[in-house]
């Protein structure tokens, strides 16, 4: 859980409780064990647009 009083992480990043800061989700490809990668899976890094109405 994000520390109280901190700003939400920007798009494409997720809060790391182990490091007490936002971390880039791109690094999860190389190292998926990192604690913040769970947050990356829950929030896709790029906007998603449906291909149908």
């Amino acid at each position: 859980e994000q520390a109280p009083g901190t700003a939400p992480c920007s798009r494409g990043s997720s809060w790391s409780a182990d490091l007490d800061k936002c971390m880039d989700c791109a690094s999860c490809r190389a190292r998926p064990h990192s604690d913040f990668c769970l947050g990356c899976a829950a929030a896709p890094p790029a906007p998603f647009r449906l291909l149908w109405p």
Epitope: A17, D18, D20, R31, H33, D35
Partner: antibody, heavy 120, light 108 residues
Framework: EVQLLESGGGLVQPGGSLRLSCAAS????????MMWVRQAPGKGLEWVSY????????HYADSVKGRFTISRDNSKNTLYLQMNSLRAEDTAVYYC?????????????WGQGTLVTVSS | DIQMTQSPSSLSASVGDRVTITCRAS??????LNWYQQKPGKAPKLLIY???SLQSGVPSRFSGSGSGTDFTLTISSLQPEDFATYYC??????????FGQGTKVEIK
């Protein structure tokens, strides 16, 4: 100059307790993750425990889980390791070490170590 | 857990020799591999981080290479102060890190 100074080691009987301290100086302590590593006499290095910069997240090796507790006091620039239910196999030199400031990829500064001997 | 295996466990070399120590991971760890030097009665000292980056203040005769599962620490020209034990350490699963068993470099 970055310095880490461990203290609190000594001789303790099996089942006993000990509290180790690691006093940090020469750098701003609060942004850095920290860890404890131990080395049994004549053996290699074994990771023991990790704590996040705020102290809100902690991790332990299976060999000490439920018996050891890592903590820190950022206002005192000090890291701690509370060791309970000590066993003969916990006999080792215990080192504290500082993690990198961007990630915990490496540990760049280490204390000189404090010896813990568990024996009856 | 990821196991780290170093070879050889010990080696004898002379001043000026080129020394190579290898470290193998039980699974791929990308480039998340560090090397430490430890002298008797002293704390470990970081030499190389992320497989090939030289830590500040470490002499350039030390170098690291490798990725995936196989890594190498090379001392291009062994100096008297280099006789020590060397450990590799994986940080792929940080903060759950593991060390190799160590390689002792002795005087021939």
């Amino acid at each position: 100059e970055v310095q880490l100074l461990e203290s609190g080691g000594g001789l303790v009987q099996p089942g006993g307790s000990l509290r180790l301290s690691c006093a940090a100086s020469g750098f701003t302590f609060s942004p850095y993750p920290m860890m404890w590593v131990r080395q049994a006499p004549g053996k290699g290095l074994e990771w023991v425990s990790y704590i996040s910069p705020s102290g809100g997240s902690t991790h332990y090796a299976d060999s000490v889980k439920g018996r050891f507790t890592i903590s820190r006091d950022n206002s005192k620039n000090t890291l701690y390791l509370q060791m309970n239910s000590l066993r003969a196999e916990d006999t080792a030199v215990y080192y504290c070490a500082r993690g990198g400031d961007t990630y915990f990829d490496y540990f760049d500064y280490w204390g000189q170590g404090t010896l813990v001997t568990v024996s009856s | 857990d990821i196991q780290m295996t170093q070879s050889p466990s010990s080696l004898s070399a002379s001043v000026g020799d080129r020394v190579t120590i290898t470290c193998r991971a039980s699974q791929s760890i990308s480039s998340y591999l560090n090397w430490y030097q430890q002298k008797p009665g002293k704390a470990p000292k970081l030499l190389i981080y992320q497989a090939s980056s030289l830590q500040s203040g470490v002499p350039s005769r030390f170098s690291g290479s490798g990725s995936g599962t196989d890594f190498t620490l090379t001392i291009s020209s062994l100096q008297p102060e280099d006789f020590a034990t060397y450990y590799c350490q994986q940080s792929y699963t940080s903060p759950f890190i593991t060390f190799g068993q160590g390689t002792k470099v002795e005087i021939k």
